[in-house]
Interface confidence: medium
C-alpha cells in the first residue's frame, strides 16, 4: 500500500435495473485490477422532481477523477445522471451533489440510499 | 499477461449448431465477468451475450435470444457460447472480451476471435 | 436500447494531424463511455474507458472528453500506428452497445 493512499479493495453494489442487466441487485462488490492500476468506488443517481433515484453503485477502474476522494461527492452543474467515485473501502455508501459551478452558497445534499 | 484464446469456429449450414470455447489464463478468471462481441464482415462490433463471474447471470442481445447460451466452467478457466439454430446473419468473428467489473466498465481484454460461417 | 451515433464514419488525415472523432449517446450515459482501436485482422483493443482514463499502455496523444450524451475521442497528433478503425461503447445499461466506428485513413 502507498503511504496516504485509501485503498480501495470492496465496494457498495446496487443497480436498479437489475433485471434488464442481469446482475445481483445489491451487495458488495470485490474489486479487482491490474496491480499498478488504483480502484474505486462510484454512485450514479438521478434526481426526478425532488426524488433521489439510485441507479448503480459499485467499484470503478483507475480514473484520475477520483484520485485522494475519501467522499463521493459530484460536482457538475446539474447533470441528468449525477455521478461519483471515491477511494476506500464503501466510501461510496454515501454520496453528495455539491455544484461547483453556483454563484450562490452550494448546500450539501448528503444521500444514504436506503436498502430496497 | 492476460490471455483469451477463441475456438470451435467454423462453416456450418443454416439451422446447424457450434459451440464455441474461450480458454483463459493470465488472470483469476471466476473474478470477471466475461462477454461475446461479433463482427460480421466489413461490419462492427455487435455485443452478443455475457455473464457474470460465477455464471449465476448471463444476458444475451435480442438477435440471439433463445437461440444462444453463454456458460463458463471456472474449474477450466473456460467460456462457452453454444449457437443453435444458426442463420446466415450469424456469419460473424466471435471474440470473447474480458468484463472489467460485474457490471462490464469496459471490455478490457479480447481474444483474437474465431469465424462462424452459416452457409449452404 | 441506447443507440450510439459516430461522426464522421471515415476521414483522412496525415502524419502529425490533431483527429478528432465524436460519438453521441440518444440518453445520458454518464461516465460510462469507452473507445476501442481496431486494425484490420486484429481484435479490438481497449483505449480508453470512463470517457477520459487511457488503458495500459496507450500512448498520452490519445485523449477523451465528454459527459451525458455527447463525446469525443482526440489524437493530438496522429502517428502511422493510429491509421485504424475506432468504435465508441457504452456500458451504462445492457445491451452493450457500440457505435458504427470511424475509419481513419491516409491522406
Known amino acids: 500500500a502507498i503511504l496516504g493512499r485509501s485503498e480501495t479493495q470492496e465496494c457498495l453494489f446496487f443497480n436498479a435495473n437489475w433485471e434488464r442487466d442481469r446482475t445481483n441487485q445489491t451487495g458488495v462488490e470485490p474489486c479487482y485490477g491490474d496491480k499498478d492500476k488504483r480502484r474505486h468506488c462510484f454512485a450514479t443517481w438521478k434526481n426526478i422532481s425532488g426524488s433521489i433515484e439510485i441507479v448503480k453503485q459499485g467499484c470503478w477502474l483507475d480514473d484520475i477523477n477520483c484520485y485522494d476522494r475519501t467522499d463521493c461527492i459530484e460536482k457538475k452543474d446539474s447533470p441528468e445522471v449525477y455521478f461519483c467515485c471515491c477511494e476506500g473501502n464503501m466510501c461510496n455508501e454515501k454520496f453528495s451533489y455539491f455544484p461547483e459551478m453556483e454563484v450562490t452558497q452550494p448546500t450539501s445534499n448528503p444521500v444514504t440510499p436506503k436498502p430496497p | 499477461e492476460v490471455q483469451l484464446l477463441e475456438s470451435g469456429g467454423g462453416l456450418v449450414q443454416p439451422g446447424g449448431s457450434l459451440r464455441l470455447s474461450c480458454a483463459a489464463s493470465?488472470?483469476?478468471?471466476?473474478?470477471?465477468?466475461m462477454n461475446w462481441v461479433r463482427q460480421a464482415p466489413g461490419k462492427g462490433l455487435e455485443w452478443v451475450s455475457n455473464i457474470n463471474y460465477n455464471g449465476g447471470y448471463t444476458g444475451y442481445a435480442d438477435s440471439v435470444k433463445g437461440r444462444f447460451t453463454i456458460s463458463r466452467d471456472n474449474s477450466k478457466n473456460t467460456l462457452y457460447l453454444q449457437m443453435n439454430s444458426l442463420r446466415a446473419e450469424d456469419t460473424a468473428v466471435y471474440y470473447c472480451?474480458?468484463?472489467?467489473?460485474?457490471?462490464?466498465?469496459?471490455?478490457?481484454?479480447w481474444g483474437q476471435g474465431t469465424l462462424v460461417t452459416v452457409s449452404s | 436500447d441506447i443507440q450510439m451515433t459516430q461522426s464522421p464514419s471515415s476521414l483522412s488525415a496525415s502524419v502529425g494531424d490533431r483527429v478528432t472523432i465524436t460519438c453521441r449517446a440518444s440518453q445520458s450515459i454518464s461516465r460510462y463511455l469507452n473507445w476501442y482501436q481496431q486494425k484490420p485482422g486484429k481484435a479490438p483493443k481497449l483505449l480508453i474507458y470512463?470517457?477520459?482514463s487511457l488503458a495500459s499502455g496507450v500512448p498520452s496523444r490519445f485523449s477523451g472528453s465528454g459527459s451525458g450524451t455527447d463525446f469525443t475521442l482526440t489524437i493530438s497528433s496522429l502517428q502511422p500506428e493510429d491509421f485504424a478503425t475506432y468504435y465508441c461503447q457504452q456500458s451504462y445499461e445492457s445491451p452493450l452497445t457500440f457505435g458504427g466506428g470511424t475509419k481513419v485513413e491516409i491522406k
Open positions: 493470465g488472470f483469476t478468471f471466476d473474478s470477471y465477468s
Open positions: 472480451a474480458r468484463g472489467a467489473n460485474w457490471h462490464d466498465t469496459a471490455l478490457d481484454y
Open positions: 470512463a470517457v477520459t
